[in-house]
């Protein structure tokens, strides 16, 4: 058993039918010695008397808010949450596995640049009695500071019969140098509590591996005289790290017909312009990626050919 | 992904082309190592990230773009030994910081070259003959060092009398390749920045 925050305790349990459970001793936070009784949640049934209460915790019915009283007055509370260990693996019932880029990916994180700012998000089908708390650091043995805001509900979507809720959080490394070569990963830890169930999720990454630039901006077409060709030009996104000659991007230019089946023409360039053939009803799209470290491509920026 | 190759103009900063080749070569070698050593801990998540140049060179600090010198988090340590007279420096552009930066890159390459050659000698003794260092990568390191053209003492190749532990050698290869790829990215960024200056 360990303290999550004041008066809230987590009991770690080997979780299988008929498991023996854990013996827990609760102590009433009071100088009083006599006439103390204990109750659980809203029930008035007296579970025991005395300054300490010993209970065998085996299932969720044994968790909840234990209260010690004296003569009708509340002396203190202890909220017991359960952390399930199924066959030796901590349970992951609260969050959905996003399965990208691999199984057991519950937290996903992205950064728009090398400033040390990043966003993480996760999914759940649970809509009520749910709280999250996020902590982060650079490295774990001698952690360096990363400050995270509060997790907020950022999207709701319907998936089949279920509603899916997306939560996200923004974090900023306290003293980040964009040019630094990372040797210690960023660690992100999310505590999730649903009713009386506690779970924790972690993700470990280097900023360089979660970079996803914003799409190129100011995408423009300039028709070339007496030709079906057009000059496409664009600019680096405002959110990308500077100077651009150091933090360079590479670009992919795509000409896509109206039908998804039509052949796509693709050109790769390090410049911020390209000459392509614009077909009728086609659209031109451009996306960006770090030129030297192949993390994610940005989303496409698009303009119609007409 | 193969990086697009720009053919350097005669007047172009001459090391840019070599640094692009270096990044391509080390990236290919790392990819090959990850595939060949799939049952070894060789991914970024599995390895310890060690920098063999730590406390010996300070390439990131010495090569920091001017725009980032205002960022206090980037200014941990800016002192390092330096040598001037690299051939990548057009004489008009020679500056103290630039010479310091390029000499630091040269020292990095020299240290990695020694490590890789020592490691290759061990890998050649492996009866499994599972993996060797790509000669192209070693050649590209050499080419960039020649283009930088700094005079410095040659470091003797390390020789070891004890029987090599091939498992440990292969894990060390993965660690070295990951670190060298990160340094090659920094070198490429620096060359691109200097070329634009």
């Amino acid at each position: 058993i360990w303290e999550l925050k004041k008066d809230v305790y987590v009991v770690e349990l080997d979780w299988y039918p008929d498991a023996p459970g854990e013996m827990v001793v609760l102590t009433c936070d009071t100088p009083e010695e006599d006439g103390i009784t204990w109750t659980l949640d809203q029930s008035s049934e007296v579970l025991g008397s005395g300054k300490t209460l010993t209970i065998q915790v085996k299932e969720f019915g044994d968790a909840g808010q234990y209260t010690c009283h004296k003569g009708g007055e509340v002396l203190s509370h202890s909220l017991l949450l359960l952390h399930k260990k199924e066959d030796g693996i901590w349970s992951t019932d609260i969050l959905k596995d996003q399965k990208e880029p691999k199984n057991k990916t519950f937290l996903r994180c992205e950064a728009k640049n090398y400033s040390g700012r990043f966003t993480c998000w996760w999914l759940t089908t649970i809509s009520t009695d749910l709280t999250f708390s996020v902590k982060s650091s650079r490295g774990s043995s001698d952690p360096q500071g990363v400050t995270c805001g509060a997790a907020t509900l950022s999207a709701e979507r319907v998936r089949g019969d279920n509603k899916e809720y997306e939560y996200s959080v923004e974090c900023q490394e306290d003293s980040a140098c964009p040019a630094a070569e990372e040797s210690l990963p960023i660690e992100v830890m999310v505590d999730a509590v649903h009713k009386l169930k506690y779970e924790n999720y972690t993700s470990s990454f280097f900023i360089r591996d979660i970079i996803k630039p914003d799409p190129p901006k100011n995408l423009q077409l300039k028709p070339l005289k007496n030709s079906r060709q057009v000059e496409v030009s664009w600019e680096y996104p405002d959110t990308w790290s500077t100077p651009h000659s150091y933090f360079s991007l590479t670009f992919c230019v795509q000409v896509q017909g109206k039908s998804k089946r039509e052949k796509k023409d693709r050109v790769f360039t390090d410049k911020t312009s390209a000459t392509v053939i614009c077909r009728k009803n086609a659209s031109i799209s451009v996306r960006a990626q770090d030129r030297y470290y192949s993390s994610s491509w940005s989303e496409w920026a698009s303009v119609p050919c007409s | 992904r193969n990086l697009p190759v720009a053919t350097p103009d005669p007047g172009m900063f001459p090391c840019l082309h070599h640094s692009q080749n270096l990044l391509r070569a080390v990236s290919n070698m790392l990819q090959k190592a990850r595939q060949t050593l799939e049952f070894y801990p060789c991914t970024s998540e599995e390895i310890d990230h060690e920098d063999i140049t730590k406390d010996k060179t300070s390439t990131v600090e010495a090569c920091l773009p001017l725009e980032l010198t205002k960022n206090e988090s980037c200014l941990n340590s800016r002192e390092t030994s330096f040598i001037t007279n690299g051939s990548c420096l057009a004489s008009r552009k020679t500056s103290f910081m630039m010479a310091l930066c390029l000499s630091s890159i040269y020292e990095d390459l020299k240290m990695y070259q020694v490590e890789f050659k020592t490691m290759n000698a061990k890998l050649l003794m492996d009866p499994k003959r599972q993996i060797f260092l790509d000669q192209n990568m070693l050649a590209v390191i050499d080419e960039l060092m020649q283009a930088l053209n700094f005079n410095s003492e040659t470091v003797p190749q390390k020789s070891s009398l004890e029987e090599p532990d091939f498992y440990k050698t292969k894990i060390k290869l993965c660690i070295l390749l990951h670190a060298f790829r990160i340094r090659a990215v920094t070198i490429d960024r620096v060359m691109s920045y200097l070329n634009a200056s």
């Epitope: 979780w15 299932e59 199924e86 | -």
Partner: antibody
């Protein structure tokens, strides 16, 4: 006493469908992840699918992905396996399990 | 996928013997390994989880050990009711995979 009882097996033609059920008792079913495992005649054990408590996370073996669907009804204390596009190689005894307890199994035979 | 290679595939032993069954994973699975016992015509039953933890009610003569890639199930003193087929399983990553089984027969 913990009990898991499978039902719904039988003989089915290739391409056909079956729905297996597993009735659970003796424990708080809704609080536990559950799995289906199968065993072809005279062969070893093969994991088929898993479902977490609350159905938030579901995983399938590649051999059944897209054809089989695992689900649960916590109000009825029942685990299901909907099997579509059945093939001869799906012939096996299907067990539902919540370690260390396994059901007695139900035989599925796919044959024309 | 992670392969679990169990050995031997069968063995003959007498009551009172110490029996050791090994299981080798094709890659590191930490301690996320379970062992099962299956008697002819019956369902499997869980014996060990987390490589070395006995489920409640499993006799203490059964013990498990190992981590990473090499795992062992030991029956310290074979009893008549222990003649069965034993399977190891990794649950470190999906798909979950079982060993091919070890049949323990009476000598």
């Amino acid at each position: 006493e913990v009990q898991l009882v499978e039902s719904g097996g039988g003989l089915v033609q290739p391409g056909g469908s079956l729905r297996l059920s597993c009735a659970a008792s003796g424990f708080t079913f809704s609080d536990y992840g559950m799995v289906w495992v199968r065993q072809a005649p005279g062969k070893g054990l093969e994991w088929v699918a898993s479902i977490s408590s609350g159905s938030s996370n579901i995983y399938y073996a590649d051999t059944v992905k897209g054809r089989f669907t695992i689900s649960r009804d916590d109000a009825k204390n029942t685990l299901y396996l909907q099997m579509n596009s059945l093939r001869a190689e799906d012939t096996a005894v299907y067990y539902c399990a919540r370690n260390p307890y396994w059901g007695q199994g139900t035989l599925v035979t796919v044959s024309s | 996928d992670i392969q679990m290679t169990q050995s031997p595939s069968s063995l003959s032993a007498s009551v009172g013997d110490r029996v050791t069954i090994t299981c080798k994973a094709s890659q590191n699975v930490g301690t996320n390994v379970a062992w099962y016992q299956q008697k002819p015509g019956k369902a499997p039953k869980g014996l060990i989880y987390s490589a070395s933890h006995r489920y409640s009610g499993v006799p203490s003569r059964f013990s498990g050990s190992g981590s990473g890639t090499d795992f062992t199930l030991t029956i310290s003193s074979l009893q008549p009711e222990d003649f069965a087929t034993y399977y190891c399983q990794q649950y470190n990553s999906y798909p979950l995979t079982f060993g091919g089984g070890t049949k323990v027969e009476i000598k």
